[in-house]
């Protein structure tokens, strides 16, 4: 019989229900915005905004300072007071819409939903390792702002994204706001604008450049700004918006908008459609060609990538890549395929596509029928003409007007659909050693830290744990402070180490020591942990073998048994070749001689499953007693593997030595031609791995084997005669003298 070890699913080596407690702060209300600051003198802070309040926390998440940002009209509103005696507008709560650092000063800038969306500047005052906010400055000049022209009206109640860029001695705020007709009518916020902060912090310079959704489209065409960032020579905004000005406004897609970070002007404003798809390896009948589209961006983050992912993306290590989590629609509801997919867009390729698109619009010969696009911002026109004009005038350049690049940039899910039912609500990507890790928050309040790699059929988890018991969604914005990431969920801010919260979710020594180096995992006798958790026994260099099962569970006291051991950490090498003298198996007092691996039996083990097999020949010593005993495997002097060496002993109980007894044989005669069905009765007849019934030295073919009975068919006899009949178990004869008589046919 060819018994094989049962497969152990890869998932059995980890437990994602392990509870991790990470430092947290209760903000006292739903967290609306969060940003971190790290100074060059070891001072750092976390700024957390909730309705009507701004908290300043130290790096340990202890409260350092708190500031009242509303309600507007309330005498206790600290920021309102900075604008001098009121009234400044209708009273009401302040929901923080913008919270950004101006690195040049350095200062924190907060803008809220009240007071026409104005902003406040808070100088940072380092005090030891903590940071305090100076009294806020009101970035609003009453005499410069009118309802139809308001350079100091920044935040929209519908949502605003801001990226601050230093240009020379000035700070420029790149602002993108969601609008509707009502918001647009109130102190005229703009969709996209670049505003220079005045040196005296009295507001923003008038005459700023801006683009806005045209009044006729405001009702039906809404743009959600999901993310903004600055890298290289550009600032980028990511949007979710209707795919067409004229068609169904619920048919959404994702765009990247690119603005120059070196020139505060919008002539080179460019947009590009980002297309993210799930393309299963085996396409279902009826599934769309090229994969299932996931048009709606939920969260995004850009980061330089590690060597491994860079190679897979065919880019250089350290190059900036935009990662986005996409869903099928606004509700992100389930359809066919996963709930969330992750696509990677190398920034260099995005820029190349945009640059080529500009040339395509502007070069000669003209590409007929190519539209400039962005008809929600500007009058329709064909390339190379400026918006609303029939032709270029001699002193205008085609390149100095906003443009929608005619191609989209398409990518497929990095995770091959493996996120499955998970709904990702937050994303931050880091590079650790040469590994790129996606830190993702989920709809049900969990954190997944997963290596970003392609072409695997399973996820490589750093961790997967619940932030708390509330199960509330993790919010979109994530901040980094040193070696920690800050996630918000409900009214809490959580501090999660980028190396993972711990190692206890790895259940086996092998899985523990195969964990990424940056996690700092080691084995502590019977659990995986970091050195601080078990300084006494912590080590990273070896694992004992682990026996999980063996076969058979019994063997004859006399005669040999081929024993198959199952478990892990037997070899560390796929070939399973064992150097001489490294593996010692004993069953009770008896040695079990290692057998060379039969290469014809080697099966490729998918990485999702793991099991190792070891075979040995058990020949009990004369002193061995009948009865139950233990199986012990000791491995010593093994050459080290890639992650660790195998060293130690594993013991498993449950083996029994037995003495087979033959009590009866019938019939005791049969035809010379053979074929008589012999029944041998006794005890422990099925022990071990081999048995043979011999009639005159020739094997009687076994038809059935059980503990108390053997059935076999006699071989042909040479002559009519009485011949010896014997039973061997494990090659040793079972006591008893029996004969079988061959008769004439």
């Amino acid at each position: 019989e060819d018994w094989q070890c049962p497969r152990t699913p890869y998932a059995a080596s980890r437990d994602f229900d392990v509870k991790y407690v990470v430092p947290s702060f209760s903000a006292g209300g739903l967290v609306q915005a969060m940003v971190t600051y790290e100074g060059d003198r070891n001072e750092s802070a976390v700024f957390v905004a909730i309705r009507n309040r701004l908290h300043v926390l130290g790096p340990d998440l202890k409260s350092v300072q708190s500031l009242a940002t509303g309600p507007a009209g309330d005498p206790g509103c600290q920021t309102c007071a900075a604008c001098g005696p009121g009234p400044h507008g209708p009273p009401g709560d302040t929901d923080t819409k913008v919270l950004v650092l101006d690195p040049a000063l350095p200062a924190l800038v907060s803008c809220g939903s009240s007071l026409q969306g104005r902003c406040f500047l808070h100088d940072l005052e380092p005090q030891g390792t903590a940071v305090h906010l100076a009294a806020p400055a009101c970035l609003f000049s009453a005499h410069h702002n009118r309802p139809d022209d308001c350079p100091d009206c920044v935040a929209s109640p519908l949502g605003t994204r801001v990226t601050v860029v230093e240009q020379g001695q000035a700070s420029y705020f790149y602002v993108a706001s969601s609008l509707d007709a009502a918001v647009a009518a109130s102190f005229s916020p703009r969709s996209v604008s670049i505003r220079r902060l005045k040196a005296d912090a009295s507001g923003f310079a008038p005459g700023f450049v801006a683009l806005s959704v045209l009044p006729k489209h405001l009702v039906s065409y809404s743009i959600e700004y999901v993310h903004s960032f600055h890298t290289g020579a550009f600032v980028y905004f990511l949007t979710v918006q209707p795919a067409s000005v004229t068609d169904d406004p619920s048919a959404l897609h994702t765009r990247l908008a690119r603005l120059s970070a070196t020139e505060p002007e919008l002539g080179d404003y460019r947009e590009l459609v980002l297309d993210c798809r799930f393309a299963p390896k085996r396409r279902r009948r009826g599934a769309p060609e090229g994969g299932q589209p996931y048009p709606v961006l939920r969260v995004a983050h850009s980061a330089p990538v590690g060597a491994q992912l860079a190679t897979e993306l065919s880019i250089a290590e350290g190059q900036e890549v935009l990662f986005g989590v996409f869903v099928t629609g606004k509700d992100g509801g389930p359809g066919v395929g996963p709930n969330s997919v992750v696509c990677a867009f190398p920034i260099d390729l995005l820029d190349t596509l945009i640059d080529e698109g500009v040339e395509r619009c502007c070069e000669s010969p003209v590409h007929p029928g190519l539209r400039r696009g962005l008809d929600f911002f500007q009058s329709p026109s064909f390339c190379p003409n400026p918006p609303g004009l029939e032709a270029l005038s001699p002193n205008t350049s085609c390149r100095h007007f906003p443009l929608l690049v005619s191609s989209s940039f398409s990518r497929v899910d990095l995770f091959n659909g493996l996120l499955g039912p998970v709904q990702v609500t937050a994303l931050y990507v880091t590079r650790l050693d040469n590994v790129t890790v996606a830190h993702m928050g989920t709809m049900d309040g969990r954190i997944l830290q997963v290596e970003l790699v392609r072409s695997l059929n399973y996820l490589l988890y750093v961790s997967n744990f619940s932030l708390g018991d509330s199960g509330q969604p993790v919010q979109r914005d994530v901040s980094r402070l040193g070696d920690h990431l800050l996630f918000a969920s409900g009214d809490q801010v959580f501090q999660v180490p980028i190396q993972g919260p711990g190692c206890r979710h790895f259940l086996t020594c092998g899985r523990c020591l195969r964990a990424w180096h940056f996690m700092g995992c080691g084995w502590c006798g019977n659990m995986c942990g970091q050195q601080k958790e078990c300084p006494g026994s912590w080590q990273q260099d070896h694992c004992p073998p682990k026996l999980t099962e063996f076969h058979p569970h019994s063997g004859p006291l006399r005669g040999s048994t081929r024993l198959t051991l199952c478990g892990s950490n037997f070899y560390l090498h796929p070939s399973g070749l064992v150097p001489e003298g490294t593996h010692q198996v004993t069953v009770g007092q008896s040695p079990c001689r290692p057998l060379p691996k039969d290469s014809s039996k080697l099966r490729p083990v998918p990485r999702k499953d793991f099991v190792e097999e070891f075979e040995c020949e058990l020949e009990p010593l004369g002193t061995q007693a009948v009865g139950p005993t233990n199986v012990s495997l000791t491995v010593t002097n093994m050459p080290p593997g890639k992650h660790f060496r195998v060293d130690g002993t594993s013991v498993l109980r449950g083996f029994s030595f037995m003495e087979p007894v033959l009590i009866a044989v019938q019939p005791l005669f049969g035809p010379r031609a053979g074929g008589t069905c012999l029944t041998l009765e006794g005890q422990s007849l099925s022990v071990g791995t081999s048995r043979a019934v011999l009639v005159n030295g020739t094997e009687c073919l076994l038809a059935r084997v059980s503990e108390g009975q053997l059935l076999c068919a006699t071989p042909p006899g040479a002559t009519v005669a009485s011949v010896p009949l014997s039973l061997q178990v494990g090659g040793a004869q079972v006591p008893g003298s029996w004969t079988f008589q061959y008769r004439e046919d």
């Epitope: 297309d275 798809r277 393309a279 396409r283 060609e289 090229g290 994969g291 065919s314 880019i315 250089a316 190059q319 190398p346 260099d348 390729l349 820029d351 190349t352 596509l353 640059d355 080529e356 698109g357 500009v358 040339e359 395509r360 070069e363 191609s407 989209s408 398409s410 497929v412």
Partner: antibody
Framework: QVQLVESGGGLVQPGGSLRLSCAAS????????MSWVRQAPGKGLEWVSY????????YYADSVKGRFTISRDNSKNTLYLQMNSLRAEDTAVYYC??????????WGQGTLVTVSS | DIVLTQSPATLSLSPGERATLSCRAS???????LGWYQQKPGQAPRLLIY???NRATGVPARFSGSGSGTDFTLTISSLEPEDFATYYC?????????FGQGTKVEIK
């Protein structure tokens, strides 16, 4: 008008090196990806290498990986292909071509590289 | 690598006839990252079609591209004398980018 002019081809012994250049004019060079494509005598086209507009992304065909290096100097509007450890099977006309996302829309006239002892 | 197989290897037709050239990919060329090129003896290739179905600037309307996934077609609705040449398909979705082996359209 767009022009791409290759140079640097010639006869070289197996194991030798050559550096091909492609001078570009008539368009904004630093806005375009560029590629090298070759054609052995009497044979079909074979894509050799690609470089993005800002040089941060480069790709190579398996047959030349580790031996050829693509580069560009945007200030000189020039594309290069450094070819080392040349083999007889590298004998071909080498073309430079402009663009990627909308196809390679402009090509040079090619330069012949002959690898022979 | 994506292998592009063109058929037929040679197409013998007369001027005015319709030419249909096929290009089959060994795996799906998603998002239509496929182009068609024309090459005449002693000349550099010329881009005809990009994105599977978009005509390049200056290419006559008698040339059209179609298809998606693994099967793509270049159609010349009515052959002109100057159309007798070799045609290559090219995928630029997956590195390494690859050409088909070519289809020669010759005068019957």
């Amino acid at each position: 008008q767009v022009q791409l002019v290759e140079s640097g081809g010639g006869l070289v012994q197996p194991g030798g090196s050559l550096r091909l250049s492609c001078a570009a004019s008539g368009f904004t060079f630093n806005s375009y990806s560029m590629s090298w494509v070759r054609q052995a005598p009497g044979k079909g086209l074979e894509w050799v290498s690609y470089i993005s507009s800002r040089s941060s992304t480069t790709y190579y065909a398996d047959s030349v990986k580790g031996r050829f290096t693509i580069s560009r100097d945007n200030s000189k509007n020039t594309l290069y292909l450094q070819m080392n450890s040349l083999r007889a099977e590298d004998t071909a006309v080498y073309y430079c071509a402009r663009g990627y996302f909308h196809g390679m829309d402009y090509w040079g006239q090619g330069t012949l590289v002959t690898v022979s002892s | 690598d994506i292998v592009l197989t063109q058929s037929p290897a040679t197409l013998s037709l007369s001027p005015g006839e319709r030419a249909t050239l096929s290009c089959r990919a060994s795996q799906s060329v998603s998002f239509d990252y496929l182009g068609w090129y024309q090459q005449k003896p002693g000349q550099a290739p010329r881009l005809l079609i990009y994105g599977a179905s978009n005509r390049a600037t200056g290419v006559p309307a008698r040339f059209s591209g179609s298809g998606s996934g693994t099967d793509f077609t270049l159609t010349i609705s009515s052959l002109e004398p100057e159309d007798f040449a070799t045609y290559y398909c090219f995928q630029y979705l997956i590195v390494p980018f690859t050409f088909g082996q070519g289809t020669k359209v010759e005068i019957k």
